[in-house]
């Protein structure tokens, strides 16, 4: 969370940004809020990126002005126009690329004053893992798969019954490059699993952490997955 202040004569407004992460090949959002102003035509929003000449995006007089937009962002950005009057200057970014990572500035000018704040935008790939019982194996085993990660994550297994146990000797993890030659598919197999136990497969890089849980009993298999972005908010 970054809060910036601006001064315009005696007036300043608070601009707030949130460090966030973008999943490459998907939509991303650069979050920025400011003190609302009911006069839409008096609001100017400028998004800038460190090291880039020209603007990422500009919104003024109630509409987009892309006359100074840098080519790498052409056709890839939009503000949430209907939410500008309530203080939302967040930017929607299409088809996030690795090269979109960096420091962005959200600059706001309204009839109340002006202000700006920076945000760090990280880019990579992250996805939910899915755990299944691998019946093909010679002994009962679990297979944890997640389709897209970048940079290469670490993978660790844990179990409810054997808390603190190191499963690296009884697991095998592989990383397979996906067709776009950037992200990788993560596959980890845990061998010699026991029934009536809950196992967790944890995948983590510097952008996100994902966990898949599986509980195997005689009568059923229960699964749960969650994903959290690191260092955001």
């Amino acid at each position: 969370l970054i809060i910036g202040f601006g001064i315009s004569g005696k007036h300043f407004i608070t601009v707030t940004t949130f460090t966030s992460a973008g999943n490459i090949g998907e939509d991303g959002t650069l979050s920025c809020t400011f003190e609302p102003d009911i006069k839409l035509n008096g609001i100017v929003i400028q998004w800038l990126k460190e090291g880039i000449k020209g603007l990422v995006h500009e919104f003024k007089e109630g509409k987009d002005d892309l006359s100074q937009q840098h080519e790498m962002f052409r056709g890839r950005t939009a503000v949430f126009a209907d939410q500008v009057v309530v203080g939302n200057a967040s930017l929607r970014l299409k088809n996030v690329q690795l090269t979109d990572a960096g420091t962005y500035t959200c600059y706001i000018r309204t009839s109340k004053g002006k202000g700006n704040a920076n945000l760090e935008y990280k880019t990579g790939a992250f996805s939910m893992p899915e755990i299944n019982v691998d019946y093909n194996a010679s002994s009962e085993s679990l297979r944890c798969e997640a389709p897209r990660w970048f940079p290469q994550p670490t993978v660790a297994w844990a179990s409810q019954v054997d808390q603190g146990a190191n499963f690296s000797e009884v697991s095998n993890t592989s990383f397979e490059l996906n067709s776009e030659n950037v992200t990788m598919k993560v596959v980890s197999v845990l061998y010699n699993v026991t029934i009536n136990n809950t196992y967790s497969c944890m995948i983590e890089n510097d952008i996100a952490k994902a966990t898949g849980d599986i509980k195997v009993t005689d009568s059923e298999v229960k699964r749960r997955s969650q994903l959290q972005l690191l260092n955001s908010g």
């Epitope: 490459i24 090949g25 939509d27 939009a78 126009a81 929607r92 299409k94 088809n95 067709s179």
Partner: antibody
Amino acid sequence: EVQLVQSGAEVKKPGASVKVSCKASGYTFTSYWIGWVRQAPGQGLEWIGDIYPGGGYTNYNEKFKGRVTITRDTSTSTAYLELSSLRSEDTAVYYCARLDGSSYRGAMDSWGQGTLVTVSS
Amino acid sequence: DIQMTQSPSSLSASVGDRVTITCKASQGFNKYVAWYQQKPGKAPKLLIYYTSTLQPGVPSRFSGSGSGRDYTLTISSLQPEDFATYYCLQYGNLLYAFGQGTKVEIK
């Protein structure tokens, strides 16, 4: 309501040029990309290119580069497709379509009624 | 440029059938795949965008899914008004590309 109204059918000779218009209403013309798509008789859809009326920025299918020009007139909220050096294979229905997402180039969500261009000697 | 290979080119089905149409991108990954329905003499109609988001007003029997290079349009229970030609569109890159189309005919 978003509406795109295209100009009428055209018959052209090989080697000539054609200019098709697409008049937009029901939204802020300068805030959304407009694309052009064609469909030859009995064939599939083929993307030609698009334009951002707010700045005049264009993208073109490599297949048509050098033969196609997409322009706009913001005063009349009209987009134009001009295709030169026409040949018989250019006989098709030409559609204009608004791209969803305003300055973000989205999918084509609203379409014109189409303009039949016939190229025949 | 990314090409979209759509299959099958045509299929015959009955009312109530579950129908699946697929599109395979020649390269890369992005979720920017849309699906259109077109009836003879009419302009295409947007059904689904961003892989799986249903366009407002489109019946819920239409659904989209996919990831990586493979994308699918599913009609869960075919209705008489669904007999038409369907196209996928890749719109994530600078250059857009349609699939070749799938004609859904009455068996």
